[in-house]
């Protein structure tokens, strides 16, 4: 909940009563995490139960691109999503209860910026209001974290290892293992946003295989162990 100095309250006087919108000045979150952008409002149309639309846009008020939009039918508390940019935006609040709070999943540094909430009454009480100042979302960089490391069956009774890490900036991944010489060659591919996956395609020897993820904020390591018992392929991790 927003409170104290962080609160922007925006209002205008309608002929009878008053619109207002409450949003925090700023929300901070780490890349890869989720953030909630709070937005509540009051309006002059008592007991309004007609159709309504909730909108969030980025960049600038009134004219910026919409990142989320949902519509609630008359009498309904369900706001059906019509737009969710990249599928990462979800309404947490209930517009019927004057709450437009939005959840943003899988944050990336590029999500930093200002977000503006808007509510539109599209029935008899034809009216709308939009936050002028908005809420500033600050997405901070994240040190690497290895989220999955595993050994999987490969072709011709061989094995391969997969390592998935996340961080912002996206970390560089490297494999090392019992093979003689330098680190084993790894196939690295960019994953979804802040996630990166690297594959070690052929584990030729038993032993410990270590995945290292590094970016400008730090490094992380995780290991798997490969043991093949007699003629029966198997792994121990």
């Amino acid at each position: 909940d927003a409170s104290g100095d962080l609160l922007n309250t925006e209002a205008h006087s309608a002929p009878a009563q008053r619109w207002s919108m409450q949003v925090p000045a700023e929300v901070n979150a780490e890349a890869g995490d989720a953030a909630v952008l709070p937005c509540t409002f009051t309006h002059p149309h008592r007991h309004y139960d007609g159709p309504l639309t909730a909108i969030w846009r980025s960049g600038e008020p009134y004219a910026g691109p919409q990142v989320f939009r949902c519509t609630a039918a008359p009498g309904s508390e369900l706001c059906q999503t019509a737009l969710s940019l990249h599928g990462r935006f979800r309404l947490l609040g209930n517009p019927r209860r004057n709450d437009l709070s939005l959840r943003v999943e899988r944050l990336a540094l590029a999500d930093s910026g200002r977000y503006f909430c808007r509510v539109e009454f599209t029935g008899d009480a034809h009216d709308r209001y939009e936050s002028r100042h908005g809420v500033r979302l600050r997405v901070t960089a994240a040190a690497p974290r290895i989220v999955n490391i595993s050994v999987l069956p490969g072709p011709a009774h061989a094995f391969r290892a997969l390592c998935t890490a996340e961080g912002e900036p996206p970390p560089a991944l490297a494999w090392s293992g019992p093979a003689p010489g330098n680190s084993s060659a790894a196939l690295q591919g960019q994953g979804h946003g802040y996630q990166v996956t690297a594959e070690l395609p052929a584990l030729t020897r038993d032993g410990r295989y270590t995945c290292t993820a590094a970016n400008s904020l730090g490094r992380a390591e995780a290991s798997v162990y490969l043991f093949r018992f007699h003629g029966a392929p198997g792994t121990s991790t």
Partner: antibody, heavy 122, light 107 residues
Framework: EVQLLESGGGLVQPGGSLRLSCAAS????????MSWVRQAPGKGLEWVST????????YYADSVKGRFTISRDNSKNTLYLQMNSLRAEDTAVYYC???????????????WGQGTMVTVSS | DIQMTQSPSSVSASVGDRVTITCRAS??????LAWYQQKPGKAPKLLIY???SLQSGVPSRFSGSGSGTDFTLTISSLQPEDFATYYC?????????FGQGTKLEIK
């Protein structure tokens, strides 16, 4: 390129009909309310009609209510104005205009077509 | 319907001048007001929306202010390309209505 292009204007006799079209490109047409605004020769601007992004709601100026019908085909990115029972006072340049930032409301018109001239005369 | 009244209806000014055009609404429209510029034979162009927000691409010499019933468009230093007709428009309620226009002419 973001643009609106009107067509369908011309000379018509009083009581006649005309259908104006407005082809949109360069933006997500269905996400925005669209309007028609007209301007009689040497006069100011007059709002004529607005339609919501999905086409479910339409609004008209009293001067054209019952005679004009606004519609849209979002699959073709096209806005229409069907004008029936035309009168001499309907003579004007007709502009189609896009609402800024909303599929329901025209907080302002941020994109205009070049206009098409409709002349009602016998 | 909400009536929009602009003043003056015409104004003569010179390049470099500061010019102010006012628009009055017949009832409170909060800040749901836009300003447009129109040149002969051309479509209107949005300058200001929601009373004071400058439309993208519009020079910063244009500014808008006001709320409720009284609004102002100011051009801080007139340029040759600014000579045109200016309209205000309320979007508070339907029917949307425009002012009668202010013609800005070269002195």
């Amino acid at each position: 390129e973001v643009q609106l292009l009107e067509s369908g204007g011309g000379l018509v006799q009083p009581g006649g009909s005309l259908r104006l079209s407005c082809a949109a490109s360069g933006f997500t047409f269905s996400s925005y309310a669209m309007s028609w605004v007209r301007q009689a020769p040497g006069k100011g601007l007059e709002w004529v009609s607005t339609i919501s992004g999905g086409g479910g709601s339409t609004y008209y100026a009293d001067s054209v209510k019952g005679r004009f019908t606004i519609s849209r085909d979002n699959s073709k990115n096209t806005l229409y104005l069907q004008m029936n029972s035309l009168r001499a006072e309907d003579t004007a340049v007709y502009y189609c205009a896009k609402a800024i930032g909303s599929s329901w409301y025209s907080d302002a018109f941020d994109l205009w077509g070049q206009g098409t001239m409709v002349t009602v005369s016998s | 319907d909400i009536q929009m009244t602009q003043s003056p209806s015409s104004v003569s000014a010179s390049v470099g001048d500061r010019v102010t055009i006012t628009c009055r609404a017949s009832q409170d429209i909060s800040d749901w007001l836009a300003w447009y510029q129109q040149k002969p034979g051309k479509a209107p162009k949005l300058l200001i929306y929601v009373a004071s927000s400058l439309q993208s691409g519009v020079p910063s010499r244009f500014s808008g202010s006001g709320s409720g019933t009284d609004f102002t468009l100011t051009i801080s230093s007139l340029q040759p390309e600014d000579f045109a007709t200016y309209y205000c428009q309320q979007s508070y309620s339907i029917p949307y209505t425009f002012g009668q226009g202010t013609k800005l002419e070269i002195k």
